[in-house]
Structure formats: C-alpha cells, structure tokens
C-alpha cells in the first residue's frame, strides 16, 4: 500500500541496508525510492538532542513484510519508499539548502555570481553531482562567491554539516536541464577502454545503457553480448568513467557494443523501464516466490505487483500439466540486476514494470502507428481529449491534451464567452463522439487558466490550462504527452500529426471519429510570407502542405500538433488559427509550446 506521509519522531527498527546523507527527509525518501531494495527509511534531522555526527543520516531499510517495528525517537523522521505508489516520481531536486555544506570530492572551484550560476555550472559539468556555494556574507574573504563542484561514488554527500553563509544543492541533470551533449547512438563492435566503476549483468545493450544512465558515476558503458567469445563475460555490462567524461579509446571488437549515459539528455527518455521479454533466457537471482501463471505476461504482472520483485523468469507449462499454467519465478538481487543470465533453457525473462512510473509517463510506448485526415484507432492518441460545453446544450467545443494527471493544455480562444468552468466537461479515452452518453464519465474543470497576455488567437499567447477537479488515472487509452524541452528548440521534427474531431472542410460538422493527418512543419519565414497581414512570432509554429489538402479546421482548436522524436511523442503545437482550412499556401498556425514551457510549469507547479 502507498504511504506518502512522513512519520515525525519515529524510527524504524532494523532492516538496515545502507546509510547515506541527505539534506532533508523528503530527499531521503527519493533516494530510498530509487534504491533497488529500499522500502522504508529513517532520517535524522538536526536537533540539540542528537549527536551532530548523526544529523542528516538517511538509513535505507528493507523488510520481507514491507514494514518494521516503530520506535519513538526525537528528531527521527521515517517513511516509506514511493515504490509502493502509482504516482509518477522524479529525481529532479531544485531545492537549495541554506547553511548546509554537503561534503564530497571537491574537484572544481571557481567564482560564481550566485548560487543559481553555481547550480547551472554543476548541471553543465559531466562529473558534478552537487555543489556548495559560499555566499558574499561568508566570513572568510577569499572564499566568498566560491562555487565548489563535488562528486561522490553514490551521487549523495559523504557527510552534511552545518556551515553559516553557504548554500548547497544538486545538479539539475535529472531535471533535463543540462547543456551537455547527448550521444544516443549505440556503437556496435566497439569496446571503450576506460576505468570500470561497476559491472552488472544485462540481457542487451539497451538495458545496459539504461542502467548506466541512472548510475551516479557512469558516463559510458561497454556491453558484451551473448556471442562474446569469453564465456565468463557474456551479458556483462561494464559501467565506465573517465576524467574527460568521454572514452579515451575505442577498440574494434566483434560482439561488443558500447554507448553513453543519457543522464544529460534534454529529451524525455525512458530510463528505468525495461519492458521487453527475453526468450530462451533465464535470469538468476535470489528467489522471492514461485507462482503458477498462464503466460509470461501474467508473470510480469505478478512481479510488478510484488513490491520486492525486481525481475522474473517464466517457464512455460509442459503440455497438459497444471491446467496449462507455467511456473513464474519472482526474483531479486542487491543491485536490481540478475546475478547471472543463462541461455538455451527455454525460460522467458523480464523485469518488473513498477519502475516505469519513475520515468515520465509520457515516454512510455504508445500503440504503433482534420482535413484530408484519416480515422484514428483507439489508443493511438491517448493524450487527446474532447472538451464539451453543456451550455446551452452539450456539444464538442475544442480539443485538448493531457499533460499531467490534473492538467489539460488547450487554446485560450476556446473560452470566448465561457463564463464559468462549471459548464465544461473533459472526456478522455474517446475515439467516437457517439460514445458520449448521459452516463459517460468525465472530468469536471476546477479552473481555467488563460495566458494573461492573450487577446486574440492571431496575435499569439493562444494557450490555456484546465485544472481538473479529479485526477486522471493513466491507462493505455488516457495518458499524457511529453512537453518539448527547452533544450529541443533546435530539433527539427519530421513526424508531426494534427488530430481532432473538427470539420473536414470549411462548411461541415464535427466528425464522429477522431481524425488524424500527417503534416510537415513550415519555417516561420515561409509562414510569414503566406500571412503578410499578420505577425508570425517565434511563439507560433506553422504546419501545412504547400498544395493544401490537409489541415486542422473548426473544432480542432486547442488540440495537439504531436511530433514523434526519438520514439517519444512531444506536444509541439496547439491548434490555434489559419486562413480557411487546408487552403493552398495557407499553413495552419499553432501555439509553439516550447516557448511556454516555463509558463506551464509555473502554473501547474504553483502550490
């Protein structure tokens, strides 16, 4: 069961795995969540009744029963990992800790104007995990405004002490805010010959790369495939580092693959979620349970639902045995990876999917794949919603996109004449408008947030947020789309689609089935030539065919212009305005979402 609240003056007895130092109980809970085995923790806050050497200790704990005896202790704060919870988790920590010195290896010292500049420097330095900044009030003159970049083996401080007039904080790499280059390629027949910081077993190079990405010290990796000549090294994933942050040498070796940590990538990428099945492969590890299961998919579900299970091996049933049910071996290890991987024994193996929620929900796989559009299939655009008004009668008003479990992004112009959010209904997971009946469940709207600079669609700022009265439970048919990252401003999207129930020609009616049309983006210079009477700003983005024929139209407003990049869908535009529909040399004009990411975050994260 999911327990999010922290238990004050409470200590969990026993079950210790390891002790780390964290600046707050909240961050201790995050560290516990990301640790492969931690289910509970006890944090010691600063207190006169506590020995200062125990301040800021975060003891990570495990228990077969998922709980431990509680003992009263002043200054102790205990709690449970978020592994048991279904909500999305993030390692991103933007907090700045005042008067705390987070200890680590000080490998870089320089002058900075502010703590923010120091944090940016840490975020843009390949080795930096956290920093301490001496403010201009720091007593020692020669240390004022000094920014110390630090790293440790674990990514967390080796100790934390009180120190007046300093501030500390963490790198924002996990917030996708780094400017470091991101090399996504995996290089076949390549070995990187640099120092190994760790090694784990992995079924393929992709899992190896993901493990490297969330390992605090790993900058790049080498994976030896199952065809690697040296048997003892098959399926070995070597996690590596170097002083420069890049491999010093690449050696050509058959049956090995190498690649980079994606910790600095500014795009949303799944890192924790290993969703594939590995056939004729057995994962070895500590056995948690053996259960009968109908299929390997059912076995994966069992593993996902058992909070301590990290991976599994399923052995299919022999002919008519056990009502056709096979054996599902639920397993775990100290680091979350199999201790050995064997091939040729007929098992089917895989990993728990409970870590998928640690990735942004918007990155998880969508089913493979509007004037001139074609009908969509169910679950193809799970972020698309239909926004209805109930006044004077109920009808489709606009499209919109799920961007969070309580948030819909849409166009401001949809709310002309809408006096109150009470008359709005948001329907998600809908393919056909005819599915919407009296008793169809919907989300009420608690608040309409229109950009305060919005006047009319053609002059920009055509963006609005709807805060829902209740939260959306993500399923295959209703889930969020990723916002583009500010680091993606230079990305050239080539796979963009506009979707909606809008008109198929200028004089038409709302369509029953959700329509889709693939539309190329047009440069703003080109778009400006087509709309001489308007100012096409950088806060707008245009899309359309020169010859026309495919476009958004009335009723599509507020809906998404969705573009796929690196296998992840991004909400690049919001359908805003255009001259007619699908006219020759008149592209559709969309709100350029990347330019409003800060506005969106400010509004959705406001307490």
């Amino acid at each position: 069961e999911c327990v999010t609240q922290l238990l004050k003056d409470t200590c969990f007895e026993g079950g210790d795995i390891t002790t780390v130092f964290t600046p707050s109980a909240k961050y201790c809970q995050v560290v516990c969540t990301y640790h492969p085995r931690c289910l509970l923790f006890t944090f010691t806050a600063e207190s006169p009744s506590e020995d200062p050497t125990r301040w800021f200790t975060c003891v990570l704990k495990d228990s077969v029963t998922e709980t431990l005896p509680r003992v009263n202790r002043t200054a102790a704060i205990s709690g449970y990992s978020f592994k048991q919870c279904s909500h999305q988790i993030s390692a991103c920590n933007k907090d700045i800790y005042v008067d705390l010195d987070m200890k680590g290896i000080n490998y870089n010292s320089s002058v900075a104007k502010s703590a923010q500049e120091c944090q940016e420097r840490c975020t843009d330095d390949v080795h930096c995990h956290f920093f301490t900044y001496a403010t201009r009030q720091f007593p020692s003159l020669e240390h004022r405004n000094i920014c110390l970049l630090k790293h440790t083996q674990t990514g967390t401080p080796t100790r934390i002490t009180k120190l007046d007039k300093v501030v500390s904080g963490f790198s924002l790499k996990s917030c996708a805010l780094s400017n470091l280059a991101c090399i996504r390629d995996i290089f076949p027949n390549t070995v990187f010959a640099d120092s190994n910081i760790d090694s784990v077993m992995a079924p393929d190079a992709f899992v190896c790369g993901r493990i490297c990405t969330h390992h605090p010290g790993c900058l790049f990796f080498t994976f030896f495939s199952q065809e690697w000549p040296k048997e003892s090294q098959r399926n070995l994933c070597l996690l590596k580092t170097s002083e420069s942050g890049l491999p010093s040498t690449r050696i050509k070796k058959s049956k090995a693959l190498s690649g980079f940590s994606l910790q600095s990538c500014r795009h949303s990428i799944p890192v924790f979620c290993h969703s594939s099945f590995y056939h004729d492969t057995d994962f070895l590890g500590e056995e948690l349970d053996i259960v009968a299961a109908k299929s390997h998919e059912a076995c994966q579900k069992l593993c996902t639902n058992a909070v301590r299970c990290q991976f599994f091996t399923y052995t299919p049933a022999q002919a008519s045995c056990n009502e056709g049910k096979g054996k599902c071996y639920l397993k775990l290890s100290s680091n979350g990876s199999p201790t050995k991987i064997l091939h040729g024994r007929g098992g089917i193996s895989g990993y728990t999917l409970r870590l998928c929620k640690m990735d942004n929900e918007c990155t998880t796989k969508i089913k493979p794949r509007i004037v001139g559009g074609t009908a969509s299939v169910r679950g193809e655009w799970p972020w698309q919603v239909t926004l209805h008004t109930t006044s004077p009668t109920q009808r489709h008003l606009c499209g919109g996109s799920i961007i969070g479990n309580q948030w819909i992004l849409t166009a401001a112009h949809c709310f002309y004449g809408v006096e109150s959010p009470k008359i709005l209904r948001v329907y998600s997971g809908i393919l056909n408008q005819s599915e919407i009946k009296e008793d169809t469940s919907f989300f009420g709207v608690q608040e309409i947030i229109i950009h305060d600079q919005y006047k009319m669609a053609e002059s920009g700022y055509d963006i609005a947020l709807l805060k829902l009265e209740t939260t959306v439970n993500y399923t295959d048919s209703q889930r969020p789309i990723c916002l583009p990252s500010k680091g993606d401003r230079n990305v050239i999207y080539t796979d963009c689609w506009v979707t909606g129930w809008g008109y198929r020609k200028l004089r038409d009616k709302i369509q029953n089935t959700l329509q889709k049309a693939k539309i190329p983006l047009v440069t703003n210079e080109e778009c400006q030539k087509r709309y001489r009477g308007h100012k096409i700003t950088h806060k707008m983005i245009c899309a359309g065919y020169r010859e026309g024929g495919k476009d958004a139209c009335k009723g599509d407003s507020g809906g998404p212009l969705s573009c796929k990049h690196n296998e992840v869908w991004h909400l690049v535009g919001i359908t805003s305005w255009g001259e007619g529909c699908a006219q020759r040399e008149r592209p559709g004009v969309y709100t350029n979402v990347v330019e409003y990411v800060d506005w969106i975050l400010e509004k959705t994260q406001a307490v």
Epitope: R121, N179, L180
Partner: nanobody
Framework: QVQLVESGGGSVQAGGSLRLSCAAS????????MAWFRQAPGKEREGVAL????????SYTDSVKGRFTISQDNSKNTVYLQMNSLRAEDTAVYYC???????????????WGQGTLVTVSS
C-alpha cells in the same frame, strides 16, 4: 594558454558550400572537446557541431544534420567545418571554441577564436 584562429568564412549563394578551419596552438592537450558555435545578428550564440578530440565522437544540432560535417586533423591541431547546402538562415559569425566538456553551453568552453563571418544570400 590556447589560441584559436578561424578562417574560411565568406559570402556564398544559397545551396553553395564553404569550409571553415580552426587552428589551435598552445596547451592543446588540455582540450577534451572542440566546437563550432554561431551567432546571427540579434540572436543568442548557438552550438552547431561538437567533436571530442581524443575519441572523435561527434554531435550536431538538428538544423545542420546531413549538411554540415565537423572533422579534425590531429597532426595539424586543426578542426574543420564543411558546410554544404547552405541556407540564408545559416548566415552568422562562426566561432571555434575549445574546452574540457562535450557541451552545447558556450559557458563550458574556456577558449574562443575571434570569429569568421559567413553570409548566405538567397
């Protein structure tokens, strides 16, 4: 200290090509990465292409992928930027930079050239 000197800029018609060179001298073995940045009038400086000096790893910004090629000649301590299919929007002052981080952030580079102007007319 590292000195960087760019050359090869000039005017060219859209669709044409240019090759920029950046010669490095001084304490060059401290450089982990070299990069080409550009700055168009009234715009921020943006990264175009990066190269890791020891291992040769390369990264391009999306808008130049398939048109620009960064390369290096270690014997001459020189990095090149071959620019093909040039467009009007490529008009900018192009800077060569050297630093220890393989990064798109100008702040990660300690050494800069004086810049060379590339003008593409349509």
């Amino acid at each position: 200290q590292v000195q960087l000197v760019e050359s090869g800029g000039g005017s060219v018609q859209a669709g044409g090509s240019l090759r920029l060179s950046c010669a490095a001298s001084g304490y060059t073995y401290s450089m982990g990465a070299m990069a080409w940045f550009r700055q168009a009038p009234g715009k921020e400086r943006e990264g175009v292409a990066l190269i890791a000096t020891s291992s040769g790893f390369i990264s391009y910004t999306d808008s130049v992928k398939g048109r620009f090629t960064i390369s290096q000649d270690n014997s001459k301590n020189t990095v090149y930027l071959q620019m093909n299919s040039l467009r009007a929007e490529d008009t900018a002052v192009y800077y060569c930079a050297a630093g220890t981080q393989f990064s798109w952030s100008p702040g990660s580079y300690n050494y800069w050239g004086q810049g060379t102007l590339v003008t593409v007319s349509s």
